[in-house]
């Protein structure tokens, strides 16, 4: 299942929470490549059989997207000319918690790095003056 | 031009295990699923279960679930399906299959015959 | 789970002419944010393993002669071949790959008449 002859690419992700209902960003940057259309986001979620979200030759590529994501996944398309990769994951779900792997491939050769993502009813603490 | 390339015929007695393997070869991504598909003698195609080799996530049918076990080992570029517990109607032609548009690339098969 | 029920059984057509076999499902297999037919049709030859046809409901594989097509959408899907070939007896499935359990018909056999 893998690449054959192909070089390592650096993958970076943080780990992150998610506020249940709200958006989420899952962040993931890459060492950027020149050409659009040579690079390939894909977003796995582990416990998840299909992709949560992929990017390829300059667009999104749904097709193979597991159902539990459908209609809910976005990418920073102007950004990832630049080696931004992070994912935009609308209306935070308690089940979308776990691990999640940023998944790379450029020109330049493959990448990936996995990041935990949390989810709760997070609130802003209240400041008294 | 990838290939899926599955192990030999199998006999197997009631109430054994079989392990059947799927050698990936060619240039694909660790990010295809692999699916197990089978056929019992002059019937339908019924789907087993897949996995995601790049995290080992698997998922299974209802009428295999605690029967089947779905592994991938990345080093080798292989699958494997195991089935416990066989019994005669467990007799068919195992493939594997890559998803990829619907199921793009298939393992030639494996017959596993149980008999006493 | 989404059943998908194909008719007819089984189908037999002189050389040179057309081959329809149709198959349903359950509930819809349109996305739309995609707009795709999570819909495919396979042809499989006695011994040998399935082969992709058609996927997307209207699109070839790789490889597939032109006289092979698919149409349909929602829930109604139809394979077309428009000329029979002696190569194309076979058996012809429909599997949807929209939710898992991925669920296919229980096949159509095309024979010469």
């Known amino acids: 299942f893998g690449i054959s002859g192909r070089h390592s690419i650096t993958v970076t992700t943080v780990a992150s929470a998610g506020n249940i209902g709200e958006d989420g960003i899952l962040s993931c940057t890459f060492e950027p490549d020149i050409k659009l259309s040579d690079i390939v986001i894909q977003w796995l979620k582990e416990g998840v059989l299909g992709l949560v979200h992929e990017f390829k030759e300059g667009k999104d590529e749904l097709s193979e997207q597991d159902e539990m994501f459908r209609g809910r996944t976005a990418v920073f398309a102007d950004q990832v000319i630049v080696g931004n990769a992070s994912l935009r994951l609308k209306n935070v779900q308690l089940t979308d918690a776990g691990t999640y792997k940023c998944y790379i491939i450029t020109s330049k050769g493959k990448g990936n790095a996995n990041l935990e993502y949390k989810t709760g009813a997070f609130s802003m603490p209240e400041v008294n003056v | 031009q990838v290939q899926l390339v599955q192990s030999g015929a199998e006999v197997k007695k009631p109430g054994s295990s079989v392990k059947v393997s799927c050698k990936a070869s060619g240039d694909t991504f660790t990010t295809y699923q692999i699916h197990w598909v089978r056929q019992a003698p002059g019937q339908g195609l019924e789907w087993m279960g897949g996995?995601?080799?790049?995290?080992?996530?698997?998922k299974y049918a209802q009428n295999f679930q605690g029967r089947v076990t779905i592994t991938a080992d990345e080093s080798t570029s292989t699958a494997y399906m195991e089935l416990s517990s066989l019994r005669s109607e467990d007799t068919a032609v195992y493939y594997c299959?890559?998803?990829?548009?619907?199921?793009?690339?298939w393992g030639q098969g494996t017959t596993v015959t149980v008999s006493s | 789970d989404i059943v998908m029920t194909q008719s007819p059984d089984s189908l037999a057509v002189s050389l040179g002419e057309r081959a329809t076999i149709n198959c349903k499902s359950s509930?819809?297999?349109?996305?739309?944010?995609?707009?795709?037919?999570?819909l495919a049709w396979y042809q499989q030859k006695p011994g040998q393993p399935p082969k992709l046809l058609i996927y997307w409901a209207s699109t070839r594989g790789s490889g597939v002669p032109d006289r092979f097509s698919g149409s349909g959408s929602g829930t109604d899907f139809t394979l077309t071949i428009s000329s029979l070939q002696a190569e194309d007896v076979a058996t012809y499935f429909c599997q949807q790959y929209y939710s898992t359990p991925i669920t296919f018909g229980q096949g159509t056999k095309v024979e010469i008449k």
């Open positions: 996995i995601m080799p790049i995290f080992g996530t698997t």
């Open positions: 299959a890559r998803r990829n548009y619907g199921m793009d690339v």
């Open positions: 509930q819809s297999l349109l996305y739309r944010p995609v707009n795709k037919n999570f």
